[in-house]
Interface confidence: low
């Protein structure tokens, strides 16, 4: 921690510029006032501070603030966003999508720090809700972020917010997050047409229930087999033969290939042979 | 096939610190979450806490958010449970287990005891 | 947090016989949403981890036999062993997985 010394004469910083690189530590923690940083902490990013002097400012509004920064300051930290941890960002209130924004272009291209992802978990939990436009705003930076979430975060994603989500965006996500997902999409979705809806809930059916596959097959989607693997075992083993061929179209030759693979290998099991015969594939029951 | 297994249990003294590992292996660590679980002897399961190992996010049980940490390297798809302050009823069989929502695959345990 | 309070805590039982395990919650695990039940059962044998048998209330885990069946919604649950084999004697936990992570006590299932 950096000593408390008096000011030396004339060095009283009357702006934040550039003339603060060449003091030294204890100079800008006794002759920065941090009223006046906290007023022009945009001017902090402009200027080429050392870690160690980015350590004394952090310090002056930590000092200035020991219950969480306003969300004036913390839209401005830039670059001083890197040295806030976890527990300093659990005390903020960010309700802004353009502070948000602004924090995540600090960190883009990183992966998620544990900043990152406590900030968001903070603005998610402020707003109560993942809303389209926060949903679109945190893919573009973290296309993976939809399927870090856990079950109270991913409960709180309206069925509007569906339509920011891009296939992948869902790529990392497992059957039981895509069992929450499932039913907000067919709702989202609900007033397309038949091949519309299809492209547009293709990425979610790894949620489906049988029920919702048996509809899909009357429809002749011609459902690809890397769709038909990622869905839910209990909701395949239901289906008929007859049914599994008009769901896959002209990719149902592609069971050969996965026959040793669930949860082709399970529906094969149950299935009677002759029915599986039907198909002309040498599926073996 | 997935494996966790948790090491670093033992004895320690009232008031010790203790560091437990889990690794894992047999799936990508980072799209799980990694939970720890305690069973005193003879009684049931608490809840510890949880990291999400691709960010470093953690959440805990509030009875333990301030003696203990639970941190992970992605490097080494190990998770770590640091106690710290131990005391004797924190005594019991540490367990990690992988999440999504529901704990579906658990380490076979280590076993702390804190005596004097 | 959401409590979890199994019943009875103990029971003795026979091979070949209907055993019925309950578990009540504090506060409905329901998420309305998917009308799913964020309910899980876990079998545990003296110095084993945990082993998943259950989850959603109803679907058993892969590879579990089908002895073992949940069911149950909102706060009352129940874990049925249609005919109770050798290996199933052990101690059954529910768990809930909808506000962060509670167990039942556990119900210890003795040899008569």
């Known amino acids: 921690e950096v000593e408390k010394t008096a000011c030396p004469s004339g060095k009283k910083a009357r702006e934040i510029d550039e003339s603060l690189i060449f003091y030294k530590k204890w100079e800008l923690e006794a002759c920065v006032d941090a009223a006046l940083l906290a007023t022009q902490m945009d001017r902090v990013n402009a200027i080429p501070f050392t870690y160690e002097q980015l350590d004394v400012l952090k310090h002056k509004l930590d000092e200035l603030y020991p219950q969480g920064y306003p969300e004036s300051v913390i839209q401005h930290l830039g670059y001083l966003f890197l040295k806030m941890s976890p527990e300093d960002i659990r005390k903020w209130n960010v309700t802004s999508l353009e502070t948000l924004k602004a924090l995540l272009e600090v960190n883009k291209g990183h992966e998620m720090s544990p900043q990152v992802a406590t900030l968001i978990d903070r603005f998610v939990k402020g707003r109560g809700q993942l809303d389209k436009d926060t949903l679109d705003t945190l893919t573009a930076f973290y296309p993976g972020y939809l399927c870090s979430l856990s079950p109270e975060e991913l409960s709180s994603v309206p069925p509007s917010s569906i339509w920011a989500v891009r296939p992948q965006d869902l790529d990392t996500c497992d059957p039981r997050q895509l069992d929450v997902l499932y039913p907000k999409a067919r709702l989202a979705f609900q007033n397309m047409n038949g091949s519309e809806y299809f492209v547009k809930i293709q990425s979610f059916l790894g949620g489906a229930p049988t029920e919702d596959l048996k509809a899909l097959s009357q429809q002749n989607v011609s459902m690809d087999l890397a769709t038909f693997m990622k869905l839910r075992t209990d909701a395949v083993l239901p289906l008929t033969v007859a049914e599994v061929q008009k769901l896959l179209g002209p990719h149902v030759e592609g069971l050969k290939a996965e026959e040793r693979h669930r949860p082709v290998r399970d529906w094969i099991l149950r299935q009677r042979q002759d029915d599986l015969d039907t198909l002309g594939l040498g599926l073996q029951g | 096939e997935v494996q966790l297994v948790e090491s670093g249990g033992g004895l320690v003294q009232p008031g010790g610190s203790l560091r437990l590992s889990c690794a894992a292996s047999?799936?990508?660590?980072?799209?799980?979450?990694m939970h720890w679980v305690r069973q005193a002897p003879g009684k049931g399961l608490e809840w510890v806490g949880y990291?999400?190992?691709?960010?470093?996010?953690?959440e805990y049980n509030q009875k333990f958010k301030d003696r203990f940490t639970i941190s992970a390297d992605t490097s080494k798809n190990t998770a770590y449970l640091q106690m710290n302050s131990l005391r004797a009823e924190d005594t019991a069989v540490y367990y990690c287990?992988?999440?999504?929502?529901?704990?579906?695959?658990w380490g076979q345990g280590t076993l702390v005891t804190v005596s004097s | 947090d959401i409590q979890m309070t199994q019943s009875p805590s103990s029971l003795s039982a026979s091979v070949g016989d209907r055993v019925t395990i309950t578990c009540k919650s504090s506060?409905?695990?329901?998420?309305?949403?998917?009308?799913?039940?964020?309910l899980a059962w876990y079998q545990q044998k003296p110095g084993k981890a945990p082993k998943l048998l259950i989850y959603?209330?109803?679907t058993r885990e892969s590879g579990v036999p089908s002895r073992f069946s949940g069911s149950g919604s909102g706060t009352d649950f129940t874990l049925t062993i249609s005919s109770l084999q050798p290996e199933d004697f052990a101690t059954y936990f529910c768990?809930?997985?909808?506000?962060?992570?509670?167990f039942g006590q556990g119900t210890k299932v003795e040899i008569k």
């Open positions: 287990a992988r999440s999504r929502w529901l704990l579906d695959y």
């Open positions: 047999g799936y990508t660590f980072t799209t799980y979450w």
């Open positions: 990291i999400r190992p691709s960010t470093g996010y953690t």
């Open positions: 506060q409905s695990v329901l998420y309305s949403s998917n009308q799913k039940n964020y």
């Open positions: 959603w209330a109803s």
């Open positions: 768990h809930q997985y909808l506000s962060s992570y509670t």
